[in-house]
C-alpha cells in the first residue's frame, strides 16, 4: 500500500448532551429524590472527576499520499484516524437509564470510524504512463460505538442507540431513535 503519513493535529470528540436520550419518566419520582436531574446520581458525583477526562474519542488528522503500485497521488489527502478510549455510559452526560452502571462491568464502547467520504485522486505514474483517476474512501468522523454480541467486531452498534434491558417487573424503556446508517461502502482503490 505504501502510504506516507504525517500527523497534523487531533480533535477530541466530546459528546453533546443532545446525543443521549432524555431520562425515562419512571425514574422521575419521589423515590429517586429528583436524581434524574443529576443523571440518576445524588447531587454530588459518585465517581472521581478525573474519570471523565480519562475517556475521550479523538480524531487524529493524517496527511497521506495514495499509492497504487508505482503510481502516487499528485497531492496528499487528509483523513482521520480514530484513537482513544470511550468511557462507560454512566460517565457521559445525561446517560441516566442507558445502562446499569452499578454493575462492575458493562457495555464496551470503542472509538471507531463513523462516517466516510469519497475523494477522487489523480495518480501520477513513472515512465510516461498516463495519470490514473481513483476514488478513495476516507474516514470523515469518529464515534463511540458499542461492541455487541449480536455483531462482529467490525460491525458496531451506535453509542446513541444503546438502551438498557428493562428490569424485571418494570415497564420497558422506549428504545432511542436509531442513528442514521453509515454511508454506503465506497469503492476502495487501496
Amino acid at each position: 500500500q505504501g502510504w506516507q503519513a504525517f500527523k497534523n493535529d487531533a480533535t477530541e470528540i466530546i459528546p453533546e448532551l443532545g446525543e443521549y436520550p432524555e431520562p425515562p419518566p419512571e425514574l422521575e419520582n419521589n423515590k429517586t429524590m429528583n436524581r434524574a436531574e443529576n443523571g440518576g446520581r445524588p447531587p454530588h458525583h459518585p465517581f472521581e472527576t478525573k474519570d471523565v477526562s480519562e475517556y475521550s474519542c479523538r480524531e487524529l488528522h493524517f496527511t497521506r499520499y495514495v499509492t497504487d503500485g508505482p503510481c502516487r497521488s499528485a497531492k496528499p489527502v487528509t483523513e482521520l484516524v480514530c484513537s482513544g478510549q470511550c468511557g462507560p455510559a454512566r460517565l457521559l452526560p445525561n446517560a441516566i437509564g442507558r445502562g446499569k452502571w452499578w454493575r462492575p462491568s458493562g457495555p464496551d464502547f470503542r472509538c471507531i470510524p463513523d462516517r466516510y467520504r469519497a475523494q477522487r485522486v489523480q495518480l501520477l505514474c513513472p515512465g510516461g504512463e498516463a495519470p490514473r483517476a481513483r476514488k478513495v474512501r476516507l474516514v470523515a468522523s469518529c464515534k463511540c460505538k458499542r461492541l455487541t454480541r449480536f455483531h462482529n467486531q467490525s460491525e458496531l452498534k451506535d453509542f446513541g442507540t444503546e438502551a438498557a434491558r428493562p428490569q424485571k417487573g418494570r415497564k420497558p424503556r422506549p428504545r432511542a431513535r436509531s442513528a442514521k446508517a453509515n454511508q454506503a461502502e465506497l469503492e476502495n482503490a487501496y
Epitope: 454493575r103 462492575p104 458493562g106 458499542r146
Partner: antibody, heavy 119, light 110 residues
C-alpha cells in the same frame, strides 16, 4: 481510610438462615454500588449479588436467586445479605466489595466473613 | 467450571514479562468491559485493571490489560517477587445476567 468490615458469619446447618452485615467507613456510602463476592475454600471468586443505591438496582447470581436477599441502609452505612435455605455449597468466605466508578470494577474490598454450612 | 477460562498457573523469573490470558465468549468479554484482580496469599482481592486497560491509582504501570474479540490478557513486566499471587479476570455476562470470574491463575515468581 476507606474500609468495609463484614460480620455475621458462622456455622449453620443446611436449610437454616444467616444474615451477613457489612459496615462501611471512610467514604460517602451513598456514592457506592455494593456487592457480595464469595470464595469457597481453596477455590476461586464467585460473584453473589450487587445493589445500586435504590432497591430496583439489584442483581443476583443464578446460584443464589430466590434464596438470598441483598439490601442496604444508607443511614447506617451498612450492606446486608439475608441468606435463607442455606446449602453445603454456600460454604465460603464472603467478601463485601464496592464500586463507585461506572462499570469500573470492584475497587474497595472488605476482609471477609466465613460462612460454614454443615450438618 | 468457570465461564471465563484462565490457565491455572503461570511463572516467571524476576525482571521477566509474563502474560495471563482470559478466554470468554460473545456474551461476556465480547461485549462487556474486562476487569482484573490480584489476590495476594491470605488477603482480599484488589482491583488491578478496569475497563479492559485502565489502572486504578496506585497500581504500577508494570501491569497492563488488553482485550481482543472474546479474549483478554494481563501483562506484567519487570516481574517482582511481590507479584506472586492469584490473578482473576472478570466481566459481566449478558446471557447469565451475572458478573463472572475466571477460575484464577496462580503466578509463581521463580
Amino acid at each position: 481510610e476507606v474500609q468495609l468490615v463484614e460480620s455475621g458469619g458462622g456455622l449453620v446447618q443446611p436449610g437454616r438462615s444467616l444474615r451477613l452485615s457489612c459496615a462501611a467507613s471512610g467514604f460517602t456510602f451513598e456514592d457506592y454500588a455494593l456487592h457480595w463476592v464469595r470464595q469457597a475454600p481453596g477455590k476461586g471468586l464467585e460473584w453473589v449479588s450487587g445493589i445500586g443505591w435504590d432497591d430496583d438496582m439489584i442483581d443476583y447470581a443464578d446460584s443464589v436467586k430466590g434464596r438470598f436477599t441483598i439490601s442496604r441502609d444508607n443511614a447506617k452505612n451498612s450492606l446486608y445479605l439475608q441468606m435463607n435455605s442455606l446449602r453445603v455449597e454456600d460454604t465460603a468466605l464472603y467478601y463485601c466489595a464496592g464500586n463507585n466508578r461506572g462499570y469500573g470494577g470492584l475497587d474497595v474490598w472488605g476482609q471477609g466473613t466465613t460462612v460454614t454450612v454443615s450438618s | 467450571q468457570s465461564v471465563l477460562t484462565q490457565p491455572p498457573s503461570a511463572s516467571g523469573t524476576p525482571g521477566q514479562r509474563v502474560t495471563i490470558s482470559c478466554s470468554g465468549s460473545s456474551s461476556n468479554i465480547g461485549s462487556n468491559t474486562v476487569n482484573w484482580y490480584q489476590q495476594l496469599p491470605g488477603t482480599a482481592p484488589k482491583l488491578l485493571i478496569y475497563n479492559n486497560n485502565q489502572r486504578p491509582s496506585g497500581v504500577p504501570d508494570r501491569f497492563s490489560g488488553s482485550k481482543s474479540g472474546t479474549s483478554a490478557s494481563l501483562a506484567i513486566s519487570g516481574l517482582q517477587s511481590e507479584d506472586e499471587a492469584d490473578y482473576y479476570c472478570a466481566a459481566w455476562d449478558d446471557s447469565l445476567d451475572s458478573y463472572v470470574f475466571g477460575g484464577g491463575t496462580k503466578l509463581t515468581v521463580l
